[in-house]
């Protein structure tokens, strides 16, 4: 399981952290799947995009997401790291002008059309593991991650004080 303990202690002030550059330091086009190998897909319905978590049929093409990586500085009084207190934040865009957004009131993940500069709700702190396993923590709500709930993406609170099985917040990135 993916260890998240200690996350909240150092991310309480995420909303105060600053993106150090307007341009991403790198971008990466990848398909997104759950830890259990279900695909994250995006469908245009009634002029808005819906997000699905589903098993794809054999040879069915996976949807791609553009991950844009930004550097963000910890608030210096919070981290004690000085110039070295960097985090990676990502935005996720499955199609032009649309980005994943955290809706903290509804505990949901939505696709919104918007212009740059993107709102804070579109930024997620990247927690990454070996072999392209990642999780996405809301910039606007520390300790809350994109996760899978009832075959949909949702926002899930990770309580670092408990030894939770957190596979539902783990995602795999792949080029295929």
């Amino acid at each position: 399981a993916f260890g998240i303990s200690g996350v909240q202690k150092y991310t309480r002030a995420l909303h105060d952290s600053s993106i150090t550059g307007i341009s991403p330091i790198t971008e990466y086009l990848a398909s997104l799947s759950t830890y259990n190998d279900q695909s994250i897909t995006f469908a245009l319905e009634d002029e808005s995009y819906e997000i699905y978590v589903e098993d794809l049929k054999k040879d069915e093409k996976k949807d791609k997401v553009l991950l844009s990586y930004y550097e963000s500085q910890h608030p210096s009084n919070e981290s004690g790291d000085g110039v070295d207190g960097k985090m990676l934040m990502v935005t996720l865009s499955p199609t032009k002008d649309f980005w994943l957004h955290a809706n903290n009131k509804e505990h949901s993940v939505e696709l919104h059309k918007c212009e740059k500069p993107l709102p804070d709700q579109a930024f997620f702190v990247l927690h990454n593991m070996h072999s392209n396993c990642v999780s996405f923590e809301c910039k606007t709500d520390p300790g809350v991650f994109i996760g899978v709930k009832d075959n949909h993406l949702a926002l899930i609170k990770v309580d670092s004080s408990e030894n939770l099985c957190t596979e539902n917040i783990l995602f795999k990135l792949s080029e295929t």
Epitope: T26, A30, D81, M87, N128, M129, S131
Partner: antibody
């Protein structure tokens, strides 16, 4: 200022054990992945082992799996490498390094000065 | 496992030269590549991360480029203090170093 200080190296006979320590300062240790990288005399760099920020996930070079164990004590800002069943090919300078970003296994931003391990009879 | 191949293994150049070092990955590494510098008797030092981002405190004569499997470190005007061995390093899948390029003065 970020500092990483490795200790515990020395001369050891094949088959014996050694434990390396790396004490970190100048950054919030519990936020960062930590690594051990080695360099045999006159050779290139070789990644050996990694541990994530809370110690729950560890990774090893195939040739050291089952013999080496990486661990960390976040309260003491220290990462360890327990090396058992040492072989002559483990002879190298062992460097401790920290991750470049909080919570991320991407990149190594700082390295210690290294500690030399010599395995010889 | 991803293999990283650096070329040339040794490079001789003169002060002021524009120097290019190459690193090739066995698979696409999506720009997840760093360059570090190691001087004799010293620990390695990070120069470039994520292919083209200059680490804090590193002179601007160093730059990186590339994508997919092919990556380059360029020193725009070689200085005597740049004599060192340069390693590329990927972290797209696991962690792997290239064999290094030793840069010497002519």
């Amino acid at each position: 200022e970020v500092q990483l200080v490795e200790t515990g190296g020395g001369l050891v006979q094949p088959g014996r054990s050694l434990k390396l320590s790396c004490v970190a300062s100048g950054f919030t240790f519990s936020n960062y992945w930590m690594y051990w990288i080695r360099q045999a005399p006159g050779m290139g760099l070789e990644w050996v082992s990694s541990i994530n920020n809370d110690g729950g996930n560890t990774y090893y070079l195939d040739s050291v799996k089952g013999r080496f164990t990486i661990s960390r004590n976040n309260a003491e800002n220290t990462v360890y490498l327990q090396m058992n069943s040492l072989r002559s090919e483990d002879t190298a300078t062992y460097y401790c390094a920290k991750g470049h970003y909080s919570y991320s296994s991407y990149s190594f931003s700082y390295w210690g000065q290294g500690t030399l391990v010599t395995v010889s009879s | 496992d991803i293999q990283m191949t650096q070329s040339p293994s040794v490079l001789s150049a003169s002060v002021g030269d524009r120097v290019t070092l190459s690193c090739k990955a066995s698979h696409n590494i999506n720009k997840h590549l760093d360059w570090c510098q190691q001087k004799v008797g010293e620990a390695p030092k990070l120069l470039i991360y994520f292919t083209n981002n200059l680490q804090t405190g590193i002179p601007s004569r160093f730059s990186g480029s590339g994508s997919g499997t092919d990556y380059t470190l360029t020193i725009s005007s070689l200085q005597p203090e740049d004599v060192a061995t340069y390693f590329c390093f990927q972290y797209n899948s696991g962690w792997t170093f290239g064999g290094g390029t030793k840069l010497e003065l002519k």
